[in-house]
């Protein structure tokens, strides 16, 4: 069964800057990745970035840089300043669509009492939804 992993890390240099990394553990090719915060996309969450393998990347503040790391993983850096900046208990969700298999979404947040610059290993997060 395909799985999605989510890793959230607070940058040591900028304490209010976050890096989110997400990956898809499955055999299908990825057709779309959507990163959101505040809950799953379409269920109260707010879209931060959309990554399409052919048409490119779109991102919304406070997202600063979204990029493909591999064909099945992405990373997103969030700006740390301003009213819309994330806080330590913010939930981030990644939804991977794999055509024609379907889509899988998982969420994660900063590990409790984690030191800046440290993070939990990118183990699979609980799968919230598989369409």
């Amino acid at each position: 069964t395909p799985e999605v992993w989510v890793q959230v890390r607070m940058e040591a240099t900028e304490l209010s800057s976050f890096t989110i990394r997400c990956g898809f553990l499955g055999s299908g090719s990825i057709s779309l990745v959507t990163v959101s915060w505040g809950g799953p996309n379409g269920a109260g969450g707010t879209t931060l970035a959309v990554l399409h393998p052919e048409r490119g990347i779109r991102q919304w503040a406070p997202a600063r840089q979204a990029r493909w790391e591999t064909q099945s993983s992405i990373s997103l850096i969030l700006e740390g300043s301003g009213a819309s900046s994330p806080c330590a208990n913010t939930t981030f969700c990644c939804k991977f669509a794999s055509f024609p298999e379907g889509s899988w979404e998982a969420c994660g947040s900063l590990p409790p009492s984690s030191d800046p610059g440290l993070s939990a290993p990118p183990t699979p997060a609980p799968i919230l939804r598989a369409d």
């Epitope: 048409r55 490119g56 991102q59 919304w60 024609p100």
Partner: antibody, heavy 117, light 107 residues
């Protein structure tokens, strides 16, 4: 109500310039990709250009270097600056919305551009 | 560039007929395809998105199917207001490309 209203079309001589505008209302403009699509008289639809929410631009090969798409999110406005116009650019130009990357869903009524001497 | 070959270019049909229009992509586009209806002097209107999902407010007699390179728009029972020109659009990669159109005329 979601609405797109184009303006700026008209008659222009070959080699001339024209700037099309599109006023958007009824939705959060900055969240959407915006496109220009044209239709020559009696012909089919042809995609011209796309601009992403943060200003990423994409063009049809035949207009690259001549046309420039831009947007002003604060004014809910989309533009198409057309230079070095040719007779083959004569068409109705439509402003179109897309919730990236799910395809164009809302179209304006179009504005007519005629390139002729 | 991805070419979209639409067929037929025109067809004559009667009210109540079942009508099928096909689009073939020159390479795989997954389900990144929409179908549009255009009436003379009017802007196009989206009927189908993601190859098979019905746009809100569009009558259920319209349906879409297919994925990869072969796509079909079906009108199960043609109504007088359905006489128009239909286009497919691939939005999988740039440049976005439309099919050549199918004009549905009254027999």
């Amino acid at each position: 109500e979601v609405q797109l209203v184009e303006s700026g079309g008209g008659l222009v001589q070959p080699g001339g310039s024209l700037r099309l505008s599109c006023a958007a209302s009824g939705f959060t403009f900055r969240n959407y990709d915006m496109h220009w699509v044209r239709q020559a008289p009696g012909k089919g639809l042809e995609w011209v250009s796309d601009i992403g929410n943060s200003g990423e631009t994409y063009y049809l090969g035949s207009v690259k270097g001549r046309f420039t798409i831009s947007r002003e999110n604060a004014k809910n406005s989309l533009y198409l600056q057309m230079n070095s116009l040719r007779a083959g650019d004569t068409a109705v130009y439509y402003c179109v919305r897309e919730e990236f990357p799910h395809g164009m869903d809302v179209w304006g009524q179009g504005t007519t551009v005629t390139v002729s001497s | 560039d991805i070419q979209m070959t639409q067929s037929p270019s025109s067809l004559s049909a009667s009210v109540g007929d079942r009508v099928t229009i096909t689009c073939r992509a020159s390479q795989g586009i997954r389900n990144d395809l929409g179908w549009y209806q255009q009436k003379p002097g009017k802007a196009p209107k989206r009927l189908i998105y993601a190859a098979s999902s019905l746009q809100s407010g569009v009558p259920s007699r319209f349906s879409g199917s297919g994925s990869g390179t072969e796509f079909t728009l079906t009108i199960s029972s043609l109504q007088p207001e359905d006489f128009a020109t239909y286009y497919c659009l691939q939005h999988n990669s740039y440049p976005l490309t439309f099919g050549g159109g199918t004009k549905v005329e009254i027999k």
